[in-house]
């Protein structure tokens, strides 16, 4: 399972983490700081 | 496929401290946060909190603070979880959990029992 | 934190028959971190349902759940014997995670 940097027009998408392409879902995912969730690292649970 | 692959049942004297393991496959390992969930008769299922398998941070549930410690290796593609000072308490299974994309729990390990007995 | 309150504890319902199940919380949850798991004797939980309405992978199209704020709720249209287990409502809504105490589901 291989995955890269998102392109450069998701610059932004992620707005507590890092966004990244998985390759084998050709899905952009954000991979949030902890303490966030939410498909766009959106949520702050604390 | 996903599979979360736990360390066997565990048997061990109150007092002393047991670690845990939780081996990640058929994933990119460090793409997903990894939770540790404790199920006992008495309390049904209790959060004990999540890790971030690529930043190596904890949150943990204040309950368990001092009780649980959570730690990642990434080279093994492996979590850990560590109990200190087991009393008869601490008895239950303890699941790891992968967190989905947008934070539902999508994938659990098979579960680790826990007895502490002298 | 965010208490969980499902009801009933314990059902039994007959093959065909529609069940429901509610999940209350103690304060308001965002249905976006509002999910339901379903666990059998001996298994681990599995994902039934996420984000209040969204049926997980390989769960049947009988499953359905609706609810917003602090109600939310499980149904099944047609009750099946494999339906049979305890179920879960889970909050991600705030730092403690917490789950309900379940309800067993059982074939009348």
């Known amino acids: 399972v291989s995955i890269t940097k998102c392109s450069s027009d998701m610059n932004g998408y992620c707005l507590h983490g890092q966004c990244i392409y998985l390759v084998d879902m050709s899905q952009n995912y954000c991979r949030c700081e902890v303490g966030y969730t939410g498909v766009r690292c959106e949520h702050f649970f604390l | 496929q996903v599979q979360l692959q736990q360390s066997g049942a565990e048997l061990v004297r109150p007092g002393v401290s047991v670690k845990i393991s939780c081996k990640g496959s058929?994933?990119?390992?460090?793409?997903?946060?990894l939770h540790w969930v404790k199920q006992s008769h008495a309390r049904s299922l209790e959060w004990i909190g999540v890790i971030s398998t690529y930043y190596g941070d904890a949150i943990y549930n204040q309950k368990f603070k001092g009780k649980a410690t959570m730690t990642v290796d990434k080279s093994s593609s492996t979590a850990y979880m560590e109990l200190a000072r087991l009393t008869s308490e601490d008895s239950a299974i303890y699941y790891c959990?992968?967190?989905?994309?947008?934070?539902?729990?999508?994938?659990w390990g098979q579960g680790t029992t826990l007895t502490v007995s002298s | 934190q965010i208490v969980l309150t499902q009801s009933p504890a314990i059902m039994s319902a007959s093959l065909g028959e529609r069940v429901t199940m509610t999940c209350t919380a103690s304060s308001s949850v965002s249905s976006s971190y509002l999910h339901w798991y379903q666990q059998k004797p001996g298994s681990s939980p599995k994902l039934w349902i996420y984000s209040t309405s969204n049926l997980a992978s390989g769960v049947p199209a009988r499953f359905s759940g609706s609810g917003s704020g602090t109600s939310y709720s499980l149904t099944i249209t047609n009750m099946e014997a494999e339906d049979s287990a305890t179920y879960y409502c889970?909050?991600?809504?705030?730092?403690?995670?917490?789950f309900g105490a379940g309800t067993k589901l059982e074939l009348k």
């Open positions: 889970h909050q991600y809504h705030r730092s403690p995670l917490t």
């Open positions: 058929g994933y990119t390992f460090t793409v997903y946060s």
């Open positions: 959990a992968r967190e989905g994309n947008g934070n539902p729990l999508d994938y």
